[in-house]
């Protein structure tokens, strides 16, 4: 579409402005310019016929333009007259017409302004300001910047006089800032130098710091006084009503009880001539008690007893807190506080709750800490682990169990050979063994004080021959690039040599491969269907050996990437079209076909008889695999043309 | 002075063909644009065709589109219509008539006498 | 293609009178509209193109105004040799005429 463009839109007086003209038509006849919105031959500015290359002057021809071969008009030494729309007229090769409507205004350089001001030195909340911005500039928008920001929204800021003078009402010390004033049009913004306004105040309501007003005895006290106030404030102090002296910081050190009582700081304006005062009551303090935690039950029992802690001794207004491991209180349902925070309750104790426990006083001065105290939580026994987890052993070894149960008090262990108690003893050790000691060992573990026992049976076998192995997997249907797997060889055995076979051959060296828990474990990362191989372990000692059956590793793999045969793409019109489809994938993919886009059949095979050119068309195979998600196609183009009209065509099935 | 003199016309039988000439005189004519158009008896004015100055844009009414050629010869001052396929429907004075050098936006400024085709069996 | 109609199609009127003849184009047509005078026997003659500029040698009793859609040529005081058929042209694309007015002495 045929455009103007306006370079610039928004012209100084005295410049130039170009009527950019785009996408002009090819083949053209010529082109005319016009003043205004329209097409009117009273205010054609030039004319051009580019056959004749003849440019035409209009009656609104200044002398001014320039018409230029792309029919881009230039004017220069822009007017204020020259504001307005123009419009360009085509004319193309076959007297077809096109036009488009351009604009641009025009605008006068500004001077860089000033601010004058009607007040210097206003009082807060008593005088008002006027600012002007000068001089005085038709067609100018005028903008005022504070802090080099814009206008606050406020109802004590007014502007006037088409924003020219800036009012400020009933000034405040916040009014204190740098003021600039802006005079803009849309070919200059010129800003003036800042001014700023000096706002007399105060002084306010002094403040004492710090704020805190208990001490203890023996204690500096050194209070200072702050009254926001311009000019600065000058500062007295007075000690229940008695004059001190006149300085900013009061200091008395090593106070007493005695020095208990009223301080008033006095603040001073001398330009405003105003006074305030502040007054704050200092209390000194002897030194409080120290805080100590007690309990209702020295030794809860997990999951059974709750507890509560109790925060000593109970003093009137005082604030109680708590600590646990250092930190304050979590947010748990089974940490209750009572209404004064002075007890401290553990519902439902478990072994994780034994603290330490501190509890704090908090008074006008400081926080005193109790000592630690720490919950004694009687817990377990937890079920026994046996080490080590070996289930076969040789004869004529040393047989070493050691049997071990979480516990609070520690457990009291028992060992059973087949049900027959043994020792009490934390390790059983049987040496030089034999086929005989092959049974059921059991471990028991007593927890005396909260009466609970807990056992653990381990299956021993002894045999100089080796039992035939297994192999458990963690995924028996991988997907192919997605899952690991990971083959473990049992049982474990003491003194065992682990071994792994693929496809009758040793391990590969493979990244994807790795060994570990002794050799026990074989794990086959982003496995691959080239992974799916018979798998064996076997086990040996100095005295045997065996092996394991194998185990086919399944893994899921494709669709691949489906192939159609046969590859011919063009057919004579009468033969059978008979289309096969193939994709490699694990389980066997579902197939399905599209026409140039039209569902078919779900089979592999898609067949017509005596096609047509009507035929003609992309053949879609789709292969879908529902055990990995995943899904694949491939577009075949088939080319159909009438008999014995094209040689090389396949005849078809 | 702007002359256009038209030439060609007469009885013609349905199917027939007949071409029809323009002279022109007075002006530059090969940077002037050019153009045909008829007026059937009793009947209001209707725009034929239009030719460029070097002959290589043309326009064309539907009614006519196919089966009439405008051309022109510059060398003779000379403007052409060829008209074949006629139809009792193309009866009628045809004009010729030029296109202003500045035409903003396009118009006929001057015109010839006019030459009758009359289609009849 | 573009329609123009003209209204009305014939008119009686007397020497020194006003007359004024529309003319609407079925879209928009911007300025592109001429008005030609055509008596009979004769070719017809340009009198306004443009919509509102005046062709050389043309009476300034005639004037042409409007734009985009409506248009109107108007006659500001009748002359005997003013009668005869006024047509509208569109110079869009073709270059289609209005069926014309007839003004006819009353």
């Known amino acids: 579409k045929l455009t103007i463009e306006s370079t610039p839109f928004n012209v100084a007086e005295g410049k130039e402005v170009l009527l950019l003209v785009h996408n002009l038509p090819q083949h053209l006849f010529g082109y005319s310019w016009y003043k205004g919105e329209r097409v009117d031959g009273n205010r054609q500015i030039i004319g051009y016929v580019i056959g004749t290359q003849q440019a035409t002057p209009g009656p609104a021809y200044s002398g001014r333009e320039i018409i230029y071969p792309n029919a881009s008009l230039l004017i220069q030494n822009i007017i204020q007259n020259d504001t307005g729309f123009y419009t360009l007229h085509v004319i193309k090769s076959d007297l077809v017409n096109e036009e488009a409507t351009g604009q641009f205004r025009v605008y006068p350089e500004l001077p860089k302004p000033s601010i004058s001001s009607n007040n210097s030195k206003p009082v807060e909340d008593k005088d008002a300001v006027a600012f002007t911005c000068e001089p005085e500039t038709q067609d100018a928008t005028y903008l005022w910047w504070v802090n080099n920001q814009s206008l606050p929204v406020s109802p004590r800021l007014q502007l006037s006089n088409g924003n020219r003078t800036l009012t400020l009402f009933n000034v405040t010390r916040n009014d204190t800032a740098s003021y600039k004033c802006e005079t803009q049009n849309p070919v200059s913004a010129r800003r003036s130098d800042s001014v700023i306004l000096n706002v007399l105040y105060g002084p306010d309501a002094p403040t004492i710091s710090p704020l805190n007003t208990s001490y203890r005895s023996g204690e500096n006290l050194n209070l200072s006084c702050h009254a926001a106030s311009n000019p600065p404030a000058q500062y007295s102090w007075f000690v229940n009503g008695t004059f001190q002296q006149s300085t900013q910081e009061l200091f008395i050190p090593n106070i007493t009880v005695n020095n208990s009582g009223s301080y008033t700081c006095q603040a001073h304006n001398s330009d405003t001539g105003l006074n305030r005062t502040t007054v704050t009551t200092i209390t000194v303090y002897a030194e409080p008690p120290k805080p100590f935690i007690t309990s209702n039950n020295s030794n809860p029992v997990e999951d059974e007893d709750a507890v509560a802690l109790t925060c000593e001794p109970e003093i009137q207004n005082t604030t109680y807190l708590w600590w646990v491991n250092n930190q304050s209180l979590p947010v748990s349902p089974r940490l209750q506080l009572s209404n004064d925070n002075r007890t401290l309750t553990l519902l439902s104790v478990t072994r994780n709750d034994v603290g330490p426990y501190e509890c704090g006083i908090q008074n006008e001065l400081s926080v005193d800490h109790s000592d630690p105290v720490i919950l004694n939580v009687l817990y377990g026994p937890d079920d026994p682990t046996i080490s080590p987890s070996y289930t076969y052993y040789r004869p004529g070894v040393n047989l070493s169990l050691s049997c071990h149960a979480a516990s609070n008090p520690p457990a009291q262990y028992s060992w059973l050979i087949d049900g027959n108690i043994q020792q009490h003893t934390q390790e059983l050790f049987i040496s030089n063994i034999t086929e005989k000691n092959s049974g059921l060992y059991t471990c028991q573990a007593n927890n005396s004080a909260s009466g609970h026992s807990r056992t653990t049976v381990k299956t021993i076998t002894v045999s100089a021959e080796l039992p035939k192995p297994s192999i458990s997997s963690n995924n028996s249907k991988p997907v192919e690039d997605k899952d690991a797997v990971a083959f473990t060889c049992e049982p474990e055995a003491q003194n065992t040599t682990y071994l792994w076979w693929v496809n009758g051959q040793s391990l590969p060296v493979s990244p994807r491969l790795q060994l570990s828990n002794g050799n026990r474990t074989l794990t086959l990362f982003n496995v691959t269907r080239n992974d799916a191989r018979a798998y064996v372990c076997g086990i040996q000692n100095s005295v045997s050996a065996n092996r394991s059956d194998p185990v086919t590793l399944d893994v899921l793999y494709g669709p691949d990437t489906p192939i159609i045969s046969p590859p011919d793409s063009s057919y004579l019109s009468g033969a059978n079209l008979n289309l096969s489809c193939h994709s490699a994938s694990n389980p066997s993919p579902q197939y399905s076909w599209r026409i140039n886009g039209i569902p078919q059949q779900h089979t592999q095979v898609l067949f017509i008889a005596k096609i047509t050119p009507n035929n003609n068309g992309t053949y879609a195979c789709f292969v879908s695999n529902l055990a990995t998600g995943r899904n694949n196609s491939i577009v075949k183009s088939i080319t159909v043309s009438a008999s014995g009209t094209s040689p090389g065509l396949s005849a078809g099935a | 002075e702007v002359q256009l003199l038209e030439s060609g016309g007469g009885l013609v039988q349905p199917g027939g063909s007949l071409r029809l000439s323009c002279a022109a005189s007075?002006?530059?004519?090969?940077?002037?644009?050019m153009g045909w158009v008829r007026q059937a008896p009793g009947k209001g004015l209707e725009w034929v065709s239009s030719?460029?100055?070097?002959?290589?844009?043309?326009s064309y009414a539907d009614s006519v589109k196919g089966r009439f050629t405008i051309s022109r010869d510059n060398s003779k001052n000379t403007l052409y219509l060829q008209m074949n396929s006629l139809r009792a429907e193309d009866t009628a004075v045809y004009y010729c008539?030029?296109?202003?050098?500045?035409?903003?936006?396009?118009?006929?400024?001057?015109w010839g006498q006019g030459t009758l085709v009359t289609v009849s069996s | 293609d573009i329609q123009m109609t003209q209204s009305p199609s014939s008119l009686s009127a007397s020497v020194g009178d006003r007359v004024t003849i529309t003319c609407r184009a079925s879209?928009?047509?911007?300025?592109?509209l001429n008005w030609y005078q055509q008596k009979p026997g004769k070719a017809p003659k340009l009198l306004i193109y443009?919509?509102?500029s005046l062709q050389s040698g043309v009476p300034s009793r005639f004037s042409g105004s409007g734009s985009g859609t409506d248009f109107t040529l108007t006659i500001s005081s009748l002359q005997p040799e003013d009668f005869a058929t006024y047509y509208c042209?569109?110079?869009?694309?073709?270059?289609?005429f209005g069926q014309g007015t007839k003004l006819e002495i009353k």
């Open positions: 008539a030029r296109y202003p050098p500045v035409p903003f936006p396009p118009h006929l400024d001057y």
């Open positions: 007075g002006f530059t004519f090969s940077s002037s644009y």
């Open positions: 030719i460029g100055s070097g002959s290589y844009s043309t």
């Open positions: 879209q928009s047509i911007s300025s592109y």
């Open positions: 443009a919509a509102s």
């Open positions: 042209q569109q110079a869009g694309n073709p270059h289609t």
